[in-house]
Interface confidence: low
């Protein structure tokens, strides 16, 4: 039984580390109160209200973040890794995940992505946590609960709905976002489209559905005519800055 609350996400702040290393019982998820949605800052949030988000690996962070120990002097408990904002082009890096979408790490510097730069399989291996429900009904061999995958660079970028590991796998105008326990290419949001804001305070439900971020020049804000609605059902839409 999957007794989970499906929570959507706009800025793609991915799953919190699974409890007990295996997400509890097979097919179960960390539950939060029904109807409780994340609200609060997204990729445009200011440092004042930013809540550090603990992580164990890059895949648990948003597409515009990577997982690392905060530098000395930064807020955060010693030894704990948190999701940090990705590094823009020409900034220093140690691995691809540190660079913002559309960039990769070459010779310690974030460079614009160009498929000719990527020999097949150069991107580091990504771990996908498979929180299975029931049995894994594979046509052929069974698959382990935790699968290590070498991230493939496709000659053809992923179209809407196709599987991806990170946003650079997706065609222009799409980002890589979680859908159930997978990640698929979804459209970057346009003006007026529904988005989801994150609080990251205390709520640790599994984010089974995610939305892309709002497109350039847009921010995820509460819809004007929904102020009367209860907090849990307020709609946010992508609006001009």
């Amino acid at each position: 039984t999957l007794n989970s609350v499906l929570i959507n996400s706009n800025a793609i702040k991915n799953l919190p580390p699974p409890l007990g290393g295996a997400g509890g019982q097979p097919g179960s998820a960390v539950s939060v109160a029904p109807g409780v949605l994340y609200e609060g800052g997204n990729k445009y949030q200011t440092l004042d209200n930013y809540q550090p988000y603990p992580c164990a690996e890059d895949e648990e962070c948003g597409s515009d973040e990577y997982c690392s120990s905060p530098s000395r002097g930064a807020a955060g408990v010693g030894g704990v890794q948190i999701c940090l904002a990705c590094r823009k082009r020409r900034k220093r890096c140690m691995r691809h995940a540190m660079c913002c979408p559309g960039n990769y790490c070459k010779n310690g510097i974030c460079m614009p992505s160009d498929h000719s730069h990527f020999p097949r399989g150069e991107i580091e291996e990504s771990i996908i946590e498979n929180l299975g429900n029931d049995h894994n009904a594979a046509a052929g061999d069974g698959y382990p609960r935790r699968t290590t995958l070498t991230s493939k660079i496709y000659h053809t970028k992923g179209q809407e709905g196709s599987v991806c590991l990170r946003s650079s796998d997706c065609a222009a105008g799409l980002c890589c976002a979680r859908h159930f326990w997978s990640k698929i290419c979804k459209p970057v949001l346009k003006e007026g489209q529904v988005c989801t804001k994150h609080k990251r305070k205390g709520s640790h439900g599994l984010e089974i559905f995610q939305r892309c971020y709002c497109g350039e020049g847009l921010a995820c804000r509460i819809q004007k005519d929904h102020h009367q609605a209860s907090n849990s059902s307020r709609l946010h839409t992508c609006q001009r800055h």
Partner: antibody, heavy 118, light 112 residues
């Protein structure tokens, strides 16, 4: 273009078994998770089961009413989705649709009719 | 066992606008800002018209729009045309055993 063609439907007695197939073409089958949705005669749509792609370990999902009786599987080499239906009941009578679940059910087959009757 | 409630039928004249409602609970439609709408003509397969509350897949007319407030989602069809006559189903996600839930369907009749 995306095409999904179901087959394997027919008349079966209560308690019997049937295996539905769905042949997919026009897209990279292995990159999408796939679903079965059914529709009883004159009734609404009901989600039955879903299976993810290889990268997610072929995780399977079932509606409560079919869990333990139905098994979803896929053969990526044949671009085919399957639904093995055992211990069939009269209430399983429906048109069974195979659907690609990209962003929600974005492409559907034309359906295959399963009739469970004695 | 219908999880989402829709009116059995609605009707409108060509050129008019109609709205179909879809009501759920905080455990399904009200809990998540994810609602899809499907159109189904008699004897045909369903077709995705709206996803994520108000997004249209490519190829779907901009006469179709979606919205949501609280536990209720709505599909609005403006400038009604004869070919819009069909059954319409809402769909959302849910906590608990059934992860995908549909509405009971609404038959849209275009008068005249």
């Amino acid at each position: 273009q995306v095409q999904l063609v179901e087959s394997g439907g027919g008349l079966v007695q209560p308690g019997g078994s049937l295996r539905l197939s769905c042949a997919a073409s026009g897209f990279t089958f292995s990159s999408y998770w796939m679903s079965w949705v059914r529709q009883a005669p004159g009734k609404g749509l009901e989600w039955v089961s879903s299976i993810e792609h290889k990268d997610a370990g072929y995780t399977t999902w079932y509606a409560a009413g079919v869990k333990g009786r139905f098994t979803i599987s896929r053969d990526n080499s044949k671009n085919t989705l399957y639904l093995q239906m055992n211990s069939l009941r009269a209430e399983d009578t429906a048109v069974y649709y195979c659907a690609r679940h990209g962003i929600d059910f974005d492409h559907w087959g034309q359906g295959t009719l399963v009739t469970v009757s004695s | 066992d219908i999880a989402l409630t829709q009116p059995a039928s609605v009707s409108g004249s060509p050129g008019q606008s109609i709205t179909i409602s879809c009501t759920g609970t905080s455990s399904d439609l009200g809990g998540y800002n994810y609602v899809s709408w499907y159109q189904q003509h008699p004897g045909k397969a369903p077709k995705l018209m709206i996803y994520d509350v108000n997004n249209r897949p490519s190829g779907v007319s901009n006469r179709f729009s979606g919205s949501k407030s609280g536990n209720t989602a709505s599909l609005t069809i403006s400038g009604l045309q004869a070919e819009d006559e069909a059954d319409y189903y809402c769909q959302s996600y849910a906590s608990g055993n059934t992860k995908v839930v549909f509405g009971g369907g609404t038959k849209l009749t275009v008068l005249g």
